[in-house]
C-alpha cells in the first residue's frame, strides 16, 4: 500500500514538473509574442505616421487629379526611359484626355520650355497601329501628328503642345506617371 502511495506521489511530482515546464514555455511564448506585437505596433505606427506626413506625390513630382508626373532631367532612348520610370514604380506617361494633355503641355512650358519628351506611346511594326504601353489605343484626338519616315521602331513624344513621332533610339527627355496616393486620414 505504501509502495502504491509512493508511486502515485512520484507520478504527481512528475506531472507537476511537466506543468511547470509547460508554464515556463507558455511564459516564454507570451513574452516573445509581446515583443513581436510591440515590433509590429512600432512598424505600423511608423508606417501610419509617414503615410500621414506624406503628400499624394513624391518630391519633385507634379500632381494633377489622381496622377503624379515626373519630368526627367536626363536624356535617354525610349526603352531606357521606360526602365527609368519602372525603377520609380511608374510607367511612361499615358495621356488619357485632352485635359491631361493641356495640363502636361502647360506644366512643361513652365518648367523647361520647348523640348522633346518621350511618352508611353509606340507604333506596332506590323499593323502600324499606335498603342499605349498597356495595350490600349489612343483616343482619335491624341494620335501623333506626323508619321515618322523611319525603318526602325517608332515611338511617341510630346513637344510644345503636340504629340509627334520619332525613331525610338533617339535621345530625349521623358515623363513618368504613377497613381497619386489617396489620403484616407
Amino acid at each position: 500500500k505504501l509502495l502504491q502511495v509512493s508511486t502515485i506521489a512520484m507520478q504527481q511530482q512528475e506531472k507537476l514538473i511537466q506543468q511547470e515546464r509547460a508554464l515556463l514555455n507558455f511564459t516564454e511564448w507570451k513574452r516573445s509574442c509581446a515583443l513581436q506585437m510591440k515590433y509590429c505596433q512600432a512598424f505600423m505606427q511608423n508606417s501610419l505616421s509617414s503615410a500621414h506626413n506624406s503628400s499624394p506625390c513624391p518630391n519633385n513630382w507634379i500632381q494633377n487629379r489622381e496622377s503624379c508626373y515626373y519630368v526627367s532631367e536626363i536624356w535617354s532612348i525610349w526603352h531606357t526611359s521606360q526602365e527609368n520610370c519602372l525603377k520609380e514604380g511608374s510607367t511612361l506617361l499615358q495621356i488619357e484626355s485632352k485635359e491631361e494633355m493641356d495640363f502636361i503641355t502647360g506644366s512643361l512650358r513652365k518648367i523647361k520650355g520647348s523640348y522633346d519628351y518621350w511618352v508611353g506611346l509606340s507604333q506596332d511594326g506590323h499593323s502600324g497601329r499606335w498603342l499605349w504601353q498597356d495595350g490600349s489605343s489612343p483616343s482619335p484626338g491624341l494620335l501623333p501628328a506626323e508619321r515618322s519616315q523611319s525603318a526602325n521602331q517608332v515611338c511617341g513624344y510630346v513637344k510644345s503642345n503636340s504629340l509627334l513621332s520619332s525613331n525610338c533610339s533617339t535621345w530625349k527627355y521623358f515623363i513618368c506617371e504613377k497613381y497619386a496616393l489617396r489620403s484616407s486620414v
Epitope: 519602372l86 525603377k87 520609380e88 514604380g89 511608374s90 498597356d134 495595350g135 506617371e177 504613377k178 497613381y179
Partner: nanobody, 115 residues
Amino acid sequence: QVQLQESGGGLVQPGGSLRLSCAASGRIFDINAMGWYRQAPGKQRELVAAITNGGQTTYADSVKGRFTISRDNAGNTVYLQMNSLRPEDTAVYYCKAFTRSDDYWGQGTQVTVSS
C-alpha cells in the same frame, strides 16, 4: 538583397499557352516594379512586360493582346500569362525586380515554341 525564382517554362506548340511565375523573397519592400524580359539566341535581352506596385502595366509591341502580366495580392509573385504563342516567342525568359538603386534578375526559364 532580393532573390527571384522563376518557374513555368517548357515546350509548347504554336498557338498554345504557358504561364510563367516569379516569386520574390528577401527585401521585397524595396521593389517598385517587376517585369519579364526575354533573350533569344544571338539577340539582345528585351523587356516583354512589367507591372508597377500601383498596378500599371507595360508591354512590348510584339506581345500586346497576347500576353498578360499580373501579380498576387501580397505583391511578391508576378505572373506572365502567354497565349497564342509563336515560334518567335522562343527564348529564355528572365524575371527582373526594379528598385530605385538596383535591379535584380532571376536565373531564367526556357520557353520553346515548336511543333
